[in-house]
C-alpha cells in the first residue's frame, strides 16, 4: 500500500503540474511598427508580435490581428499604449488631440463587438514644445469564452510609439468558470 | 484501503497547499522617501520598503535597490508612480516636464539591461496653478528567470510623491514556465 | 488497489477543481451612472453594478457601496476611472481641475480607513476645446482579511464617464496567506 501511495503521489504531482500549466493560457503582444495604419480616427490595430522580444503566447491564438480565446475562463486583460510626437516628424494637423484606446471583445457566434475597457486623454500638444509623449494603461478582469476575440482600437495611430516596451497588450487566465 | 485513501487525501491537501504557496512569489514595494535622488535625467530608484505599511515580499529578494527573482516563472509586473509639485516645494525651473517611468530587467549572467515597460507623459505645469499632480501606471506579463533583477527608473525624481499609496511597484507569479 | 487509485484520482480531480474555485474570489464592478453624486470634492462612490454587463462577483460581497472580502488572501486590486466634459454639459466651475481616484481599505474590527492606491492628474480644461477626457488606472497587490472593505473615492464625481468600459474597479484573489 505504501508503494501504491507513493505512486499515487507521484502521478498526482505530474498530473497537477500538467493540468495547472494547461489551464493557464496567456499572451503578451507587442506592436508591429512596420504596419501601423495612418490617420487620426479610431482604427483597429492588427499587427502585433507574439513570438519575438517580449511577445509571447500560450494556449491562445493570434490571428487576423485578434487574440483568440481557446479556453473558457476568467482572464485579466491589460493594455499599455504610448503616443509620441517630435517636431522633426513634421507639424501636427491639430494641437488638440484625443488619444484613446479601446479594448474590445468580439463574439463570432453572435456577431457583435463590445468595448471591455477604454482609457485615454484629450491633449493639447502645443508647438512651444519640441517633444510630446503620453501613455495609457488599462486593465480588468473578464469572463471569456472559447472562440471570443480580443482586439485593440486606438485613435491617432500614426502617433503610436513603436517600441515593444511602450505599446502592447495581453491577457492571462486567472481561474475557470464555475 | 479506505483509511489509506483518507491519509493520501490528507497528505495531498497539505502537499498541494504547501507547494501552491511555495510556487507563488510576490512583492509589493513602496517608495522610501528619505532617500530619493535628485536629477532631471533618467535615474534608478534604489530605496524601497518591503516590510512596512503596504510593502511586502515573499519568495523574492530585495537587494541593492533591485527586486531579485528567486524562482523561474511568468509574472505580472506593475508600477504606479506619482509626481507632484506645490508652489511651496521649491523653485521649479521649467513648466515643460517629461514625467516617465521605465521598468527594467537586468540579467546578471549576460550583463544586460532591457526595458520591459515604459509610461508617462510630457506635461505643462504652469505657474498659474499652485499645485500639480500626475500619476503613471504600467503593467504587463513577463517571463522571468531566477537571478534576474527588476528595477525602476524615473525622470525628475525630486517631483515624486513619497506616499506609499502613490509610488510603488510589484510583481506576483502567475504560472510556471512549461 | 488500482480501482482504489482510480477512485483517489477521480475524487482528487473533483476536490482540487472545487477547492481551487472556492479559493479564488473575484469582483469586477462597473459604475452605476444613475446614482453618481455631485460636487468637486473627494466623495466615496457607492453605486456599482455587480450583476449586469461586465459586472460580476464571486466569493466576495458588495454591500453599502463597498466590496467586502469574505476570504483572507493576497488580491490584485485595480481601478479604472474616466472623467469627461463636453461644452453642451454646461460651463465648468473652474478650468483647473484635480481629477483623482483613491482606493481605500476599511477594517471593521479596528474602525480605520487607509488608502491603498491613488492616481490622477491636475488638468487644465480650457474653453478653447469643446470636449475633454481623462482616464486613470491604478493596480496593486495587497493582503486582505475577511471582513475588510474596499471602496473608491474620487474628486469631481460629476465629471465621471458613466460607461461600464470606462469607470470600474475590481479584485481577484491570487494566493492564500501563509
Amino acid at each position: 500500500i505504501r508503494a501504491e501511495k507513493a505512486m499515487v503521489d507521484g502521478s498526482w504531482l505530474d498530473l497537477a503540474k500538467r493540468s495547472k500549466l494547461e489551464a493557464q493560457p496567456f499572451a503578451h503582444l507587442t506592436i508591429n511598427a512596420t504596419d501601423i495604419p495612418s490617420g487620426s480616427h479610431k482604427v483597429s490595430l492588427s499587427s502585433w508580435y507574439h513570438d519575438r522580444g517580449w511577445g509571447k503566447i500560450s494556449n491562445m491564438t493570434f490571428s487576423n490581428g485578434k487574440l483568440i480565446v481557446n479556453q473558457d475562463g476568467f482572464y485579466y486583460l491589460y493594455a499599455n499604449i504610448c503616443f509620441r510626437h517630435h517636431e522633426t516628424s513634421g507639424d501636427l494637423a491639430t494641437e488638440y488631440l484625443q488619444l484613446m484606446v479601446y479594448v474590445t471583445k468580439t463574439s463570432i457566434k453572435i456577431p457583435s463587438s463590445h468595448t471591455l475597457m477604454k482609457g485615454g486623454s484629450t491633449k493639447y500638444w502645443s508647438g512651444n514644445s519640441e517633444f510630446h509623449f503620453y501613455s495609457i494603461n488599462v486593465g480588468g478582469f473578464f469572463k471569456l469564452r472559447s472562440g471570443e476575440e480580443i482586439s485593440i482600437e486606438v485613435s491617432n495611430p500614426s502617433l503610436l510609439d513603436p517600441d515593444q516596451d511602450a505599446t502592447y497588450f495581453g491577457a492571462f487566465k486567472v481561474r475557470d468558470i464555475d | 484501503i479506505r483509511a489509506e485513501k483518507a491519509m493520501v487525501d490528507g497528505s495531498w491537501l497539505d502537499l498541494a497547499k504547501r507547494s501552491k504557496l511555495e510556487a507563488q512569489p510576490f512583492a509589493h514595494l513602496t517608495i522610501n522617501a528619505t532617500d530619493i535622488p535628485s536629477g532631471s535625467h533618467k535615474v534608478s530608484l534604489s530605496s524601497w520598503y518591503h516590510d512596512r505599511g503596504w510593502g511586502k515580499i515573499s519568495n523574492m529578494t530585495f537587494s541593492n535597490g533591485k527586486l531579485i527573482v528567486n524562482q523561474d516563472g511568468f509574472y505580472y509586473l506593475y508600477a504606479n508612480i506619482c509626481f507632484r509639485h506645490h508652489e511651496t516645494s521649491g523653485d521649479l525651473a521649467t513648466e515643460y516636464l517629461q514625467l516617465m517611468v521605465y521598468v527594467t530587467k537586468t540579467s546578471i549572467k549576460i550583463p544586460s539591461s532591457h526595458t520591459l515597460m515604459k509610461g508617462g507623459s510630457t506635461k505643462y505645469w504652469s505657474g498659474n496653478s499652485e499645485f500639480h499632480f500626475y500619476s503613471i501606471n504600467v503593467g504587463g506579463f513577463f517571463k522571468l528567470r531566477s537571478g534576474e533583477e527588476i528595477s525602476i527608473e524615473v525622470s525628475n525624481p525630486s517631483l515624486l510623491d513619497p506616499d506609499q499609496d502613490a509610488t510603488y511597484f510589484g510583481a506576483f507569479k502567475v504560472r510556471d514556465i512549461d | 488497489i488500482r480501482a482504489e487509485k482510480a477512485m483517489v484520482d477521480g475524487s482528487w480531480l473533483d476536490l482540487a477543481k472545487r477547492s481551487k474555485l472556492e479559493a479564488q474570489p473575484f469582483a469586477h464592478l462597473t459604475i452605476n451612472a444613475t446614482d453618481i453624486p455631485s460636487g468637486s470634492h473627494k466623495v466615496s462612490l457607492s453605486s456599482w453594478y455587480h450583476d449586469r454587463g461586465w459586472g460580476k462577483i464571486s466569493n466576495m460581497t458588495f454591500s453599502n457601496g463597498k466590496l467586502i472580502v469574505n476570504q483572507d488572501g493576497f488580491y490584485y486590486l485595480y481601478a479604472n476611472i474616466c472623467f469627461r466634459h463636453h461644452e453642451t454639459s454646461g460651463d465648468l466651475a473652474t478650468e483647473y481641475l484635480q481629477l483623482m481616484v483613491y482606493v481605500t481599505k476599511t477594517s471593521i474590527k479596528i474602525p480605520s480607513s487607509h488608502t491603498l492606491m491613488k492616481g490622477g492628474s491636475t488638468k487644465y480644461w480650457s474653453g478653447n476645446s469643446e470636449f475633454h477626457f481623462y482616464s486613470i488606472n491604478v493596480g496593486g497587490f495587497f493582503k486582505l482579511r475577511s471582513g475588510e472593505e474596499i471602496s473608491i473615492e474620487v474628486s469631481n464625481p460629476s465629471l465621471l464617464d458613466p460607461d461600464q468600459d470606462a469607470t470600474y474597479f475590481g479584485a481577484f484573489k491570487v494566493r492564500d496567506i501563509d
Partner: antibody, heavy 122, light 107 residues
C-alpha cells in the same frame, strides 16, 4: 556661440528705477530657466531673481522681493529685470545667467553674460 | 537662508602644486554644491556641479568632493592660468547662495 549680453545699466538716484535687458543667442532660449546674479563692489555674488523657461514662475530672495521684477520674451530671446525703489546696497555688476539643465528644483549657472553696472547714488 | 562660508579669503600656491579650497554650508545640502572660477576682469565660469560632477570642457585637474555641510574643491596640479577667485554655491534650496570667494594667488 552661446552668448548673453546685458544692457541698461547706469547711474540712478536712490528710490529710482531701471530696466536691464539681456539678449541671448546661440541656444534655444525658451528651453532654459534664467536668472540675474549681481556682484557687489566687495566682490560678493548674490542671486537676485529667477524665471522658469516658460516665464510663468518667478522667484526672488527677500532682499529684492516687491522691488524687482524678472520677465522674459521668448519670441525675442530676451530677459529683463525691472528694478524699482533702488537703494545704495543695490549697487553692483548685474549678470544675466543661464540655469544649467539639472534637477528641476536646483539652480546653478553654466553661462554668464559680461555684466552691466548699476550704480545707485544717495 | 543657507549661509555658505569659505574660510580662506586668500590662498597662495605654486605652479604644479595641489591645492584644496573648502566651503561649509550652514545646514545639510546633500551634494548640491557648485564651484565657479572668476578670472580677473571676467564673468564667473561653472566648473563643478552636484559636488563632484565636472562641467563640460572643464580640465580633469579640477575636482570636487563632499556632502552634507563640508565641501572641498581641489586643483591637482596648479597652472598659471588658474589664478582666479573661486566661489562655491549651494543649489539645494532657494534662495541660491554663494560663498564669499577664495582668491588663489600664484607665488
Amino acid at each position: 556661440e552661446v552668448q548673453l549680453v546685458e544692457s541698461g545699466g547706469g547711474l540712478v538716484k536712490s528710490g529710482g528705477s531701471l530696466k536691464l535687458s539681456c539678449a541671448a543667442s546661440g541656444f534655444t532660449f525658451r528651453n532654459y530657466a534664467m536668472s540675474w546674479v549681481r556682484q557687489t563692489p566687495e566682490k560678493r555674488l548674490e542671486w537676485v531673481a529667477g524665471i522658469s523657461s516658460g516665464g510663468t514662475y518667478t522667484y526672488y530672495p527677500d532682499t529684492v522681493k516687491g522691488r524687482f521684477t524678472i520677465s522674459r520674451d521668448n519670441a525675442r530671446n530676451t530677459l529683463f529685470l525691472q528694478m524699482s525703489s533702488l537703494r545704495s546696497e543695490d549697487t553692483a555688476m548685474y549678470y544675466c545667467a543661464r540655469r544649467d539643465y539639472g534637477d528641476v528644483y536646483e539652480w546653478y549657472f553654466d553661462v554668464w553674460g559680461t555684466g552691466t553696472t548699476v550704480t545707485v547714488s544717495s | 537662508d543657507i549661509v555658505m562660508t569659505q574660510s580662506h579669503k586668500f590662498m597662495s600656491t605654486s605652479v604644479g602644486d595641489r591645492v584644496s579650497i573648502t566651503c561649509k554650508a550652514s545646514q545639510d545640502v546633500r551634494t548640491s554644491i557648485a564651484w565657479y572660477q572668476q578670472k580677473p576682469g571676467q564673468s564667473p565660469n561653472l566648473l563643478i556641479y552636484s559636488a563632484s560632477y565636472r562641467y563640460t570642457g572643464v580640465p580633469d585637474r579640477f575636482t570636487g568632493s563632499g556632502s552634507g555641510t563640508d565641501f572641498t574643491f581641489t586643483i591637482s596640479s596648479v597652472q598659471a592660468e588658474d589664478l582666479a577667485v573661486y566661489y562655491c554655491q549651494q543649489h539645494y534650496s532657494s534662495p541660491w547662495t554663494f560663498g564669499g570667494g577664495t582668491k588663489l594667488e600664484i607665488k
